[in-house]
């Protein structure tokens, strides 16, 4: 550590550059100032992201990878710092930026939404899972009629371009479907999606967005839901959804609807069975849905309800007449 009476002058890093290394991904690089007097001290660097979203952090190395949207441009600064228990010395900032890509903002797509879904891979002898990706968007309000949009995703080091589009009445792509992707259903990386475009009339502004998998992963409904009535006991059982997550990773909701009187019972469970006491001769429809529990992943979406299964008596007759 520095002694209080020692003086050192900190100089800003040099050759600070921002390189786009992938879809929604940049590499910040710099070099220590060659005129910096080292004097056996541990220099660090403070990186500040100015746009599109403010952030700052410290690092000892001279590069930093950043996952960020780029359609609004990107701006960052870095400075040399030296800190001990009670004081901080800092140089001035070195800054760099990427300008927003060409094209007016109204030409880029809006309302980009994506969902992932897991299926079992039938081509593999071992049990493995395949993740599909479906994205939809709306055409930009200022986009010329001849605009065509193209979608790409990046997950980790894998980048793919969409091959299956849905089109609007003018033939413009407005949705994309990847039946198989490189997305890992239990992965924790960001999913980056980019939609760029072209037109003979004007530049089309690209649009990129980052998605957290837990927030867009559409869980499958539970499998093989069964229900039976024995006297006044309604017993319901089911199996975990098709998913790469193991059996202990699911929360369930059971919905029991008495179709005679409209009464609805919803129970939240962590097991794959439920018994309810029923008190009259009615027909019940039973459904179950699933979500990955917070033990295994951040809270996400519930699955769709399983198809209703009907149990009980459906006769339209008075119950216990005088």
């Amino acid at each position: 550590d520095l002694l209080p009476d020692e003086k050192i002058s900190l100089l800003p890093p040099v050759n600070f550059t921002i390189k786009v290394t992938g879809l929604a991904q940049v590499l910040l690089q710099w070099k220590p100032n060659p005129d910096q007097e080292q004097r056996n001290v541990n220099l660090e660097y403070q990186v500040k992201i100015n746009a599109p979203k403010e952030d700052d952090y410290e690092t000892r190395i001279t590069e930093s990878k950043c996952v960020t949207i780029l359609h609004k441009g990107f701006s960052a600064s870095v400075r040399t710092i030296l800190q001990n228990d009670h004081s901080l010395l800092a140089s001035s900032w070195a800054s760099a930026e990427l300008h927003a890509p060409p094209g007016s903002p109204g030409t880029s797509i809006v309302n980009l939404t994506c969902t992932t879904n897991t299926t079992e891979d039938n081509y593999s002898r071992l049990r493995s899972y395949q993740v599909s990706l479906h994205c939809t968007w709306l055409v930009g309000t200022d986009a010329p009629e001849d605009t065509q949009y193209f979608l790409y995703y990046r997950y980790g080091s894998w980048t793919e371009e969409c091959q299956e589009y849905s089109k609007d009445t003018l033939g413009r792509n407005i949705a994309c479907w990847f039946p198989r992707t490189f997305i890992l259903s239990k992965g924790r990386d960001w999913l980056a999606v980019l939609v760029n475009g072209s037109s003979k009339h004007s530049a089309i502004r690209p649009f990129d967005q980052l998605f957290a998998l837990h927030a867009i992963d559409q869980i499958n409904p539970p499998l093989n839901v069964t229900a039976e009535i024995e006297g006044t006991r309604l017993s319901i059982q089911w199996e975990k959804p098709v998913s790469a997550f193991p059996i202990h990773c699911f929360d369930y909701e059971v919905k029991i609807h008495n179709t005679r009187n409209g009464y609805l019972q919803i129970e939240k469970l962590m097991t794959n069975a439920f018994i309810s006491i029923i008190d009259d001769l009615s027909k019940y429809d039973v459904q179950v849905r699933a979500a990955v529990s917070s033990m295994c992943r951040e809270a996400g979406l519930w699955s769709e309800w399983s198809q209703p299964i009907y149990v009980g008596n459906d006769e339209h007759k008075p119950l216990r007449e005088w």
Partner: antibody, heavy 115, light 110 residues
């Protein structure tokens, strides 16, 4: 004869209260969930609330706090207590029995809220 | 609360005509829908429950179909006594969502 008969309607001033009764005959009310529905003059049907066999009651969002449904199985009767009445509560009030739909209705009782 | 939207709000037809009334729920109510007929000055009468099951004593010219959010009431051949107002009602999860009626369809003589 299996029937429902509402009573207790009439003229009431704004801000006043009224309790409507629905008496069942020909069947045991204790075996059925019951509901109240109203119909303003020249308007459509509007669901008010339901009381289940268990005694639990549920209400349309607009009726919560002002309207209360109760039942007395020993009297074979269901009640609708209405408080803080307004001019827009003027309507014919029906009770109905639930059995895969509202299969039995009373004849209705008219409530007029006016000063 | 669930909202029920009925169409048309009024309809003119002649005896012998086939008539269709539709009802749309603001969310999935599966097959939990009832249809009622009401004549002036009278209480409503249950026609159909669970979307398609005819209530006791209702003529077979009345039929219901649909599930989920879209439902239809059909009168295959109108009779003079069928001129009335018709209402749909959700019977799904009343304790959660209420039991709203559609706004009604008034069927009159052309």
């Amino acid at each position: 004869e299996v029937q429902l008969v509402e009573s207790g309607g009439g003229l009431v001033q704004p801000g006043g209260s009224l309790r409507l009764s629905c008496a069942a005959s020909g069947f045991s009310l204790s075996s059925y969930d019951m509901t109240w529905v109203r119909q303003a003059p020249g308007k459509g049907l509007e669901w008010i609330g339901i009381i289940y066999v268990s005694g639990s009651a549920y209400y349309a969002s607009w009726a919560k706090g002002r309207f209360t449904i109760s039942r007395d199985n020993s009297k074979n009767t269901v009640y609708l207590q209405m408080n803080s009445l307004r001019a827009e509560d003027t309507a014919v009030y029906y009770c109905a029995r639930i059995n895969y739909g509202l299969d039995l209705w009373g004849q209705g009782t008219l409530v007029t809220v006016s000063s | 609360d669930i909202q029920m939207t009925q169409s048309p709000s009024s309809l003119s037809a002649s005896v012998g005509d086939r008539v269709t009334i539709t009802c749309q729920a603001s969310q999935n109510i599966y097959s939990n829908l009832a249809w009622y007929q009401q004549k002036p000055g009278k209480a409503p009468k249950l026609l159909i429950y669970r979307a398609s099951t005819l209530a006791s004593g209702v003529p077979s010219r009345f039929s219901g179909s649909g599930s989920g959010t879209d439902f239809t009431l059909t009168i295959s051949s109108l009779q003079p006594e069928d001129f009335a107002t018709y209402y749909c009602q959700s019977n799904y999860g009343i304790n959660y969502y209420g039991a709203a009626f559609g706004q009604g369809t008034k069927l009159t003589v052309l």
